[in-house]
Amino acid sequence: QNASRGRRQRRMHPNVSQGCQGGCATCSDYNGCLSCKPRLFFALERIGMKQIGVCLSSCPSGYYGTRYPDINKCTKCKADCDTCFNKNFCTKCKSGFYLHLGKCLDNCPEGLEANNHTMECVSIVHCEVSEWNPWSPCTKKGKTCGFKRGTETRVREIIQHPSAKGNLCPPTNETRKCTVQRKKCQKGERGKKGRERKRKKPNKGESKEAIPDSKSLESSKEIPEQRENKQQQKKRKVQDKQKSVSVSTVH
């Protein structure tokens, strides 16, 4: 049966050859494969000025395979598409295009942004933050005693970091001034010795507005260990007023 089909073919194509290469069922010296063995896909390859028929187990990049009753053929994907399931569904776009709903676009639609890694249009992700945690205790230079005015801080977490076009995160730290009932420090809550307190210049990279971390005391009743000369106390009170500010961190 194959031989008779071959003879019929030979009458139509004077150059049909019986010794076909690879997966060809019929072929000619000039045109290459004319038909393929079962399950193989027929494709045309351009060689110089002419097209040669080839039989492939899967279609090359930029083509997809379709099975018809009379031929299994490689069909070209759309011009902007590198890999596709069929004409309607591209799975990978050519360079410079972004994949969206199986189509290749040069710009992503409103509400979406281009992911230059996957070359797809993706949803814009906005920043999400948690609720504020409770305010920290009111402190001054790390102490919760021995003063009247101090600062308290609260923080919140970033739940979702934003994508490139997403809304930036709001501040995740807040500091504010606070007032406490003036209370005397207990024995174990003493400040550091005077000489450790005398650092005037901030370290390199330290903000001048940062709340100082040396432990000063403003106690109403002086006990021997806490005594400072009146001059120093006045000077330190002025410094404290200048340095107590609100700090916010933006991400």
Epitope: Y64, T66, R67, Y68, D70, F85, N86, K87, N88, F89
Partner: antibody
Framework: EVQLVESGGGVVQPGRSLRLSCAAS????????MAWVRQAPGKGLEWVAT????????YYRDSVKGRFTISRDNSKNTLYLQMNSLRAEDTAVYYC?????????WGQGTMVTVSS | DIQMTQSPSSLSASVGDRVTITCRAS??????LAWYQQKPGKSPKLLIY???SLIHGVPSRFSGSGSGTDFTLTISSLQPEDFATYFC?????????FGQGTKLEIK
């Protein structure tokens, strides 16, 4: 947006003819193979016929071969199904669809009832 | 022609259930299998192609698996809008054939 709108259905006596049309919009009609798929009341889906993008080749299921003819007019973006010698078992909703391995886009269907 | 046999033909389930529908081909169809969803009075809608590739916009609770002759469609957690009839289709050979359908109903 892809739209396929079928028309031409109705009640017809056995042995008579009917011509279904499918108007396409929202895509390049001349690039796509098109098909007719039918569904008898309360039954499954059954592929009927396919015509390739340029109209040069057509394929039919065995039970309709010689009775049905699928054709297209790419200048009018329209697909047709000429149904002759209709039988009771041809009673179904007829859908037109893009056919590219899968049936990606479907019309809303048109009902054909063959009854004496 | 390749016969496609779906089971079960109908199935009752509740919202939140995990559901599996199977489709068996009478011969090897490799990975040339698609799944469709059809709601009453509506045309079918393509959900999955090449066994497990989801059409864009189809929720990720839908998944497909299998190869050769045995295939499954799984819905991991049923939602009210998933109650419909599901069909498998092979496109490995002409004529392209469909399964008889699986009707998914609310328990």
């Amino acid at each position: 947006e892809v739209q396929l709108v079928e028309s031409g259905g109705g009640v017809v006596q056995p042995g008579r003819s009917l011509r279904l049309s499918c108007a396409a919009s929202g895509f390049t009609f001349s690039d796509y193979d098109m098909a007719w798929v039918r569904q008898a009341p309360g039954k499954g889906l059954e592929w009927v016929a396919t015509i390739i993008y340029d109209g040069s080749r057509t394929y039919y299921r065995d039970s309709v071969k010689g009775r049905f003819t699928i054709s297209r007019d790419n200048s009018k973006n329209t697909l047709y199904l000429q149904m002759n010698s209709l039988r009771a078992e041809d009673t179904a909703v007829y859908y037109c669809a893009t056919h590219d391995k899968t049936f990606d886009y479907w019309g809303q269907g048109t009902m054909v009832t063959v009854s004496s | 022609d390749i016969q496609m046999t779906q089971s079960p033909s109908s199935l009752s389930a509740s919202v939140g259930d995990r559901v599996t529908i199977t489709c068996r081909a009478s011969e090897d169809i490799y990975s040339d299998l698609a799944w469709y969803q059809q709601k009453p009075g509506k045309s079918p809608k393509l959900l999955i192609y090449d066994v497990n590739s989801l059409i864009h916009g189809v929720p990720s609770r839908f998944s497909g698996s299998g190869s050769g002759t045995d295939f499954t469609l799984t819905i991991s957690s049923l939602q009210p809008e998933d109650f419909a009839t599901y069909f498998c289709q092979q496109y490995d050979n002409y004529p392209n054939t469909f399964g008889q359908g699986t009707k998914l109903e609310i328990k």
